[in-house]
Interface confidence: low
């Protein structure tokens, strides 16, 4: 993989420890928290990033609760269990033996239970809606220009294939970015929409995960696009299972 050889760092993940102890003295990087080797030529999985983040904890955050089958990450930060490939394990438990099932982006999709709770499979999040509100500008952004700039960003910064950016909607001041990626569409080597959305979320909050890169400077035809709030909705291939109590 391509960790920067000269000073042995991981361009796509600053939450790593790198050393020239790979085969042939090549630079090898391991994620903080898990110690797992990461591929520095692409995005690191959200599970490993959350685990790394928990090794240097910050305050958890809470997001607004949406309706229907869309999930929002209301539970904030937790120390996740990741599988050998860096994906979230379907069942997550905390230190007090409270367990729950998560989707492929690590968001809880069932009520919390005890150690007897079964999560048969990791359910894929196939549709992510990123809802942004931008700060007031002199005029509305041109929709075509805004669309092109956001597509360019997801392609060049997050290495997400443009076919997974299903739509960019704009009604000033709200921008909605729809990411869609079914299990059948995701080929080996494709960046996962959940990972791209997480990197984007952290960029928007000024907490870039990239090594040594400046923060995100989003401009549309030279005009700065400054985001003042972000909401991310997750839709799974199989609807979540919550008790009626939670829905009322």
């Amino acid at each position: 993989h391509t960790a920067a050889q000269d000073n042995c760092t991981c361009p796509t993940n600053k939450m790593t420890v790198c050393s020239p102890d790979g085969p042939g003295g090549r630079c090898q990087c391991r994620a903080l928290g898990s110690g797992m080797a990461v591929d520095c030529s692409t995005l690191t999985s959200k599970c490993l990033l959350l685990k790394a983040r928990m090794s240097a904890p910050k305050n958890a955050r809470t997001l607004v609760r949406p309706s229907e089958h869309a999930l929002v990450d209301n539970d904030g930060l937790y120390d996740p269990d990741c599988d050998p490939e860096g994906r979230f394990k379907a069942r997550q438990c905390n230190q007090t033996s409270v367990c729950w099932c998560v989707n492929s982006v690590g968001v809880r999709r069932t009520d919390k239970g005890d150690l007897s709770l079964r999560c048969d499979e990791l359910v894929r999040t196939h549709h992510i809606l990123i809802d942004l509100r931008h700060r007031p500008t002199a005029g509305a952004f041109n929709h075509s220009d805004l669309d092109a700039e956001l597509r360019r960003l997801f392609r060049e910064r997050y290495r997400l294939h443009p076919k997974f950016v299903a739509a960019v909607h704009y009604e000033q001041p709200t921008i909605q970015i729809e990411l869609r990626q079914n299990t059948s569409q995701k080929a080996a080597g494709d960046v996962d929409i959940g990972d791209a959305a997480y990197y984007f979320e952290r960029d928007i909050k000024g907490e870039s995960l990239f090594q040594g890169r400046g923060g995100l400077d989003l401009r549309v035809r030279g005009e700065p696009l400054q985001v003042e709030r972000t909401l991310i909705y997750y839709l799974d291939e199989i609807p979540p299972k919550f008790s009626m109590k939670r829905l009322t």
Epitope: S144, D147, R151, R152, R155, H161, P162, K163, F164, V165, A166, A167, V168, H169, E178, R180, A187
Partner: antibody
């Protein structure tokens, strides 16, 4: 300048085949589907299919499925369309046009000038 | 395949007139409809996409509306340069399909 330039048209015998080229410049080809649309003399527009220049994924109009092949050469930002078993009804202007990924953007914002194909003995 | 039916087939207008062209889809296409103008001897050019978004550089006398199955292109004040054939296209699903075209002439 964003540009698409088609070439390869001309007079072709019935039963023969054609291979048209579309050279793209002024934009990142990998960010777009590259489409072929044709227009018979005095008639409307007909979508033939498209190719994703990243991985050569193709979607063809069922009408042409058995006769059309679309390919690409990323090193030259060129896409190709081959049409076989030509008949007189294939006489048309053939356009190359780009469209975005995601169905919200499957419209054609840039078109080539078109290349004329005449099928006649 | 989704069929797109345009009307009228042709129309004649004077400079300054208001013109309306309609397009009907054979099934619900949400707002995924684009409009093009093909001037004589030229390639088609995009005017409107997603039913109502004017493409960059298109004069504001062109406007689009509609959703579901019924769509409209309006030209508020026709100019001499607007002559040609107007096509609607659904960009909802493949195969992508066009209307048969509406020819606009200037009286």
């Amino acid at each position: 300048e964003v540009q698409l330039v088609e070439s390869g048209g001309g007079l072709i015998q019935p039963g023969g085949s054609l291979k048209l080229s579309c050279a793209a410049s002024g934009f990142t080809v990998s960010n777009y589907w590259m489409n072929w649309v044709r227009q018979a003399p005095g008639k409307g527009l007909e979508w033939m299919g498209r190719i994703d220049p990243n991985d050569s994924e193709t979607h063809y109009n069922q009408k042409f499925k058995d006769r059309v092949t679309m390919t690409r050469d990323t090193s030259t930002s060129t896409v190709y369309m081959e049409l076989s078993s030509l008949r007189s009804e294939d006489t048309a202007v053939y356009y190359c046009a780009r469209s975005g990924f995601g169905s919200t953007y499957w419209f054609f914002d840039v078109w080539g000038q078109g290349t004329t194909v005449t099928v006649s003995s | 395949a989704i069929r797109m039916t345009q009307s009228p087939f042709s129309l004649s207008a004077s400079v300054g007139d208001r013109v309306t062209i309609t397009c009907k889809a054979s099934q619900d296409v949400s707002t995924a409809v684009a409009w093009y103008l093909q001037k004589p001897g030229q390639s088609p050019q995009l005017l409107i996409y997603s039913a109502s978004y004017r493409y960059t550089g298109v004069p504001d006398r062109f406007s689009g509306s509609g959703s579901g199955t019924d769509f409209t292109l309006k030209i508020s004040r026709v100019e001499a340069e607007d002559v040609g054939v107007y096509y609607c296209q659904q960009h909802y699903s493949t195969p992508l399909t066009f209307g048969q075209g509406t020819r606009l002439e200037i009286k």
